[in-house]
């Protein structure tokens, strides 16, 4: 749809005569009839297929025609068409004399024609005004013409309909060729698709208006590129939603079980080496000179009673020193200068000669020891406590203080690892020599039956339209992450374009 515009500029009829040569009385009151039709190989009479238009009387004999378009007048003349502009045309312009006020063709005598032109033209839409001049022996007509598209029509032939809009059906203006030009922040064939916040994750984020980034279920963050871990996940992360992948040293369904007590709590003191030995369990290997479960006690080197034969021990910075009683010598007072004649055996010990009387040995009664039976027996010297238990002298008896996880007189019994019910989800616990083993019920696996396996809500592929399915382990349900263009709990509904557009 468009308009052929004809601008009449000047008509010259100096002698004021009709086509027949007869003069007009008193002068030629001139008006024009315009016929626009399809291009003809030879311009020929026939219907004005593209339209006709007439002017009022514009002047007498010779006159310039003023541009009247700004005042809503009739110059340029408008010949609207509602078809694809073909690019070529035939144009007939007749100048007529109006003796009276009635300008209808049937009201005029046939010889009222002043002049007539008929041309074949070629004209592209939007071209500048094309100036033409037709001269005969008596008259001259100067005129120009152009073709423009009607509002909302575009393209070389005014055949492309485009109406700018900024609503649910599109956000665009129209380019000169009729193609859509999306308003800032919009994209897509009809500019209906908002351009989300720059960097907004293509799959995990979406938007309903420009520069927005709304997250699909299971995702968070400004750009929806951070997954939401399983509800209650303590020391874990995720790479897809609802996961809880434990950080190093943590275990369990919610990564809240400490598998690396050494690193997290540093229980061993005085430079001891810490070894993890199970959940919240550890062993400290002490450096020389230290003892205790956590190597928190400093050992005196004299505590081991290294001095024999009643020698007294003195701690020194670089070790210890034995002060020997009379008759003894050596690093530990282990050498005697006495013989049985000197009655060297105390506490009822009996003396036996050795090396032809040069030496002796004492045979001590029970509860005494030492080369001269001078020491009461320390029941702890034989390290009777197993599994790192600490031996304590209690008068004539002794007792073992056991490390966590052990019991019995000598700490020889493992406390059942199963006592704490470590197997999750109803798993059966079995004590082993150095640890435990869980036998898991159907649907669970892992060292402690903490991993859900078979109850997979996504196994039945409940999501439609290529949506991604995520299992929510806490509720045994699924969540569908819809691709662009679909909604619904199973992504079953398309966000479809309406079937037709009202423009």
């Amino acid at each position: 749809s468009g308009v052929f515009q004809l601008q009449l500029q000047e008509f010259i009829n100096e002698r004021g005569v009709l086509a027949s040569g007869r003069p007009c009385e008193p002068g030629c009151r001139t008006f024009f009839r315009v016929c626009l039709k399809h291009f003809q190989a030879v311009v020929s009479p026939g219907p004005c297929t593209f339209g006709t238009v007439s002017t009022p009387v514009l002047g007498t004999n010779s006159f310039a025609v003023r541009d009247d378009s700004s005042g809503g007048g009739r110059n340029p003349l408008q010949l609207p068409f509602n078809f694809t502009w073909p690019g070529t045309f035939s144009l007939i312009i007749e100048a007529w004399h109006a003796p009276g006020d009635d300008l209808r063709p049937e009201a005029l005598p046939p010889d009222a024609l002043i002049s007539k032109i008929a041309i074949q033209g070629s004209l592209a839409v939007g071209q500048n005004w094309l100036l033409d001049e037709q001269t005969s022996t008596l008259t001259r007509l100067r005129y120009s013409y152009r073709v423009i598209c009607s509002d909302n029509y575009y393209g070389d032939n005014c055949s492309r309909l485009c109406k700018k809009r900024n609503d649910h059906f599109g956000h665009y203006v129209c380019q000169p060729d009729g193609n859509l030009s999306c308003l800032p922040g919009w994209t897509g064939e009809y500019c209906q698709q908002p351009i989300c916040l720059s960097g907004c994750h293509e799959q995990n984020g979406y938007c309903s208006k420009p520069a927005e980034c709304l997250c699909r279920p299971g995702w968070q963050g400004r750009l929806c590129n951070e997954c939401i871990p399983h509800n209650g996940c303590r020391h874990g992360t995720c790479s897809t939603p609802w996961q809880c992948t434990c950080d190093e040293g943590w275990g369990g369904l919610f990564c809240d079980q400490d598998l690396n007590y050494c690193t997290h709590h540093s229980p061993c003191k005085n430079g001891a080496t810490c070894s993890n030995s199970g959940q919240r369990s550890y062993t400290c290997t002490c450096r020389p000179g230290y003892t205790g479960v956590d190597c928190e006690l400093e050992l005196s080197e004299c505590d081991s009673n290294p001095c024999r034969n009643g020698g007294s021990c003195k701690d020194q910075e670089d070790g210890y020193h034995c002060l020997c009683p009379p008759g003894y010598y050596g690093l530990h007072c282990e050498h005697s200068t006495l013989s049985c004649a000197d009655s060297p055996c105390f506490n009822g010990g009996s003396c036996r000669e050795r090396n032809q009387g040069a030496n002796y040995a004492c045979e001590c009664p029970p509860n005494f020891t030492g080369s001269n039976c001078e020491k009461k027996v320390d029941r702890c010297t034989s390290n009777p406590c197993a599994n790192g238990g600490q031996c304590l002298n209690r008068g004539p008896s002794r007792m073992c203080r056991c490390r966590p996880g052990f019991t019995g007189t000598y700490c020889e019994l493992h406390v059942s690892d199963c006592a704490r019910n470590p197997c999750a989800h109803g798993g059966t616990c079995h004590d082993l020599e150095n640890g435990l083993m869980c036998t898991c019920p159907a649907g669970f696996s892992g060292r402690r039956c903490e991993v859900r396996t078979s109850i997979d809500a996504c196994a039945s592929s409940p999501c439609f339209n290529r949506a991604t399915c995520y299992t929510d382990l806490s509720t045994d349900t699924f969540v569908c992450n819809c691709p662009y263009g679909f909604v619904g709990s199973r992504c079953e509904f398309p966000v479809g374009l309406p079937p037709s557009f009202p423009w």
């Epitope: 190989a41 030879v42 311009v43 020929s44 026939g46 008929a118 033209g121 037709q134």
Partner: antibody, heavy 118, light 107 residues
């Protein structure tokens, strides 16, 4: 008196060139579309080329496209036909004509003979 | 291209006879048709244009009719000067096409 006078015809070898002219007088040449029409000896009439009144539109019959060029000089009231790569089948009397039946205009020249032969 | 089929190709008639020549177009030419008379060695002369309009100076014994694809030239009463070759020409679309011609001879 209206006159259209063709000139420039003659004998030419195949592959050769000729330029025909048509001088108009007695009417306003610049107002009308112009045509070249030919007639081979003993044959019917055959349209060759067209040019609009201002020279902006030209048309040719398929057999001469790319070989013939129609042009006009309105200041000299003259129409031209440049003929290249001539063939034996181009042999004919060439008429120029001003045709505008809407205006009752139908002016023909007497023609100029073009013979293409080796 | 629009084909113009003219008939008959030749015709013998006597002075005073009524003669009809027809032209059929291969598609609608919307009455954009002319009839020409040509005598040997002369340029064609326009008789009828727009299917039925008589050119200035042409005797009224010549008339044209028709529309769409079928057109007729009628000479109501042949005169001695009418013996010539007659052509139809469609001016609707390029390429312009003529009929093959009808040679009107004295019987």
């Amino acid at each position: 008196e209206v006159q259209l006078v063709e000139s420039g015809g003659g004998l030419v070898q195949p592959g050769g060139s000729l330029r025909l002219s048509c001088a108009a007088s007695g009417f306003t040449f610049s107002n009308y579309g112009m045509y070249w029409i030919r007639q081979a000896p003993g044959k019917g009439l055959e349209w060759v080329a067209f040019i609009s009144h201002g020279g902006g539109i030209t048309y040719y019959r398929d057999s001469v496209k790319g070989r013939f060029t129609i042009s006009r000089d309105n200041s000299k009231s003259t129409l031209y036909l440049q003929m290249n790569s001539l063939r034996a089948e181009d042999t004919a009397v060439y008429h120029c004509a001003a045709l505008n039946w809407e205006l009752g205009i139908d002016y023909w020249g007497q023609g100029t003979m073009v013979t293409v032969s080796s | 291209d629009i084909q113009m089929t003219q008939s008959p190709s030749s015709l013998s008639a006597s002075v005073g006879d009524r003669v009809t020549i027809t032209c059929r177009a291969s598609e609608d030419i919307y009455s954009n048709l002319a009839w020409y008379q040509q005598k040997p060695g002369k340029a064609p002369k326009l008789l009828i244009y727009a299917a039925n309009r008589l050119q200035d100076g042409v005797p009224s014994r010549f008339s044209g009719s028709g529309s769409g694809t079928d057109y007729t030239l009628t000479i109501s009463s042949l005169q001695p000067e009418d013996f010539a070759t007659y052509y139809c020409l469609q001016g609707s679309k390029f390429p312009l096409t003529f009929g093959q011609g009808t040679k009107l001879e004295i019987k």
